[in-house]
């Protein structure tokens, strides 16, 4: 059975994202990218204050990261 | 198929200038990051650019750093790689590859490169 | 710039053998960490990105573990298509970095 990433835990990103709704915050870089090709409103944290997501799902996997996270296939974007 | 056919390596002088190229088929090219990694003979990889899907960014490796320049042409689902002010530590085969991203809540995080082309050689020589 | 150092160099191994490769990172990367096979004349195929997990199509033998600063990349079996040269990668941070591989080599 395929496993998931590990906990990506450590990177320094600031937490909610710093960026404009239409961008995305890009953990490679430290900056803030457009998200423009993604169409899709920003996730709502469920409950939490602080919704930055600090573990990655499979890249095949679609939405449905957990309490309110996210995790979508983004096709390169960058 | 997803596919990275390259072209544009050959033999050039020291100080002389090339360009190489990277086709890009089988995917949405205007909707991914692309890199160049060069590897020198017996040598370990070295990753010299990256250009945003819409060229908005660039990154580049402190050896090629104001001699090369990475840019792309959507509408011909292309890559480029313009280098300038050849040196023969510039010999090397470079490759053209994918950025490989996910979207994790409102963070983009990276997974490497994971389509790669077939590589061109670039001899610098005198 | 961020440095990874894989041990061994190079290895010889049998059909069959588990084999074991390590990156050892100059700080920590938390789990930003692919490993690549690369043959000769041919481009680098990614095999485990985010230190741990299966690129697609990837066969099961290849497993990879580790965070922080210290990765470990396995083939619990080698296969004949496995003697080829492993290449970690992090990606971290801007610049891209590369270990210098570990040539797998056949007994």
């Known amino acids: 059975m395929r496993r998931g990433p590990r906990s990506l835990r450590g990177r320094d990103a600031p937490a909610p994202t710093p960026c404009v709704p239409a961008e995305c915050f890009d953990l490679l870089v430290r900056h803030c990218v457009a998200c423009g090709l993604l169409r899709t409103p920003r996730p709502k944290p469920a409950g939490a204050s602080s919704p930055a997501p600090r573990t990655a799902l499979q890249p095949q996997e679609s939405v449905g990261a957990g309490a309110g996270e996210a995790a979508l296939p983004l096709p390169g974007l960058l | 198929e997803v596919q990275l056919v390259q072209s544009g390596g050959g033999v050039v002088q020291p100080g002389r200038s090339l360009r190489l190229s990277c086709a890009a088929s089988?995917?949405?090219?205007?909707?991914?990051?692309m890199h160049w990694v060069r590897q020198a003979p017996g040598k370990c990889l070295e990753w010299v650019a990256v250009?945003?899907?819409?060229?908005?960014?660039?990154y580049y490796g402190d050896s090629v750093k104001g001699r090369f320049t990475i840019s792309r042409d959507n509408s011909k689902n292309t890559l480029y790689l313009q280098m300038n002010s050849l040196r023969d530590e510039d010999t090397a085969v470079y490759y053209c590859?994918?950025?490989?991203?996910?979207?994790?809540?409102?963070?983009?995080?990276?997974?490497?490169?994971?389509?790669w082309g077939q590589g061109t050689t670039v001899t610098v020589s005198s | 710039e961020i440095v990874l150092t894989q041990s061994p160099s190079s290895l010889s191994a049998s059909v069959g053998d588990r084999v074991t490769i390590t990156c050892r990172a100059s700080?920590?990367?938390?789990?930003?960490l692919n490993w690549y096979q690369q043959k000769p004349g041919k481009a680098p195929k990614l095999l485990i990105y985010?230190?741990?997990s299966l690129q697609s199509g990837v066969p099961s033998r290849f497993s990879g573990s580790g965070s922080g600063t210290d990765f470990t990349l396995t083939i619990s079996s080698l296969q004949p298509e496995d003697f080829a040269t492993y290449y970690c990668?992090?990606?971290?941070?801007?610049?891209?970095?590369f270990g210098c591989g570990t040539k797998v080599e056949i007994k």
């Open positions: 590859a994918r950025r490989f991203t996910r979207l994790r809540g409102w963070y983009i995080e990276d997974y490497g490169l994971d389509v």
């Open positions: 089988g995917f949405t090219f205007s909707m991914y990051g």
């Open positions: 250009i945003w899907y819409d060229a908005s960014n660039k």
């Open positions: 700080q920590s990367i938390s789990s930003y």
């Open positions: 985010a230190a741990s």
């Open positions: 990668q992090q990606s971290y941070s801007i610049p891209l970095t």
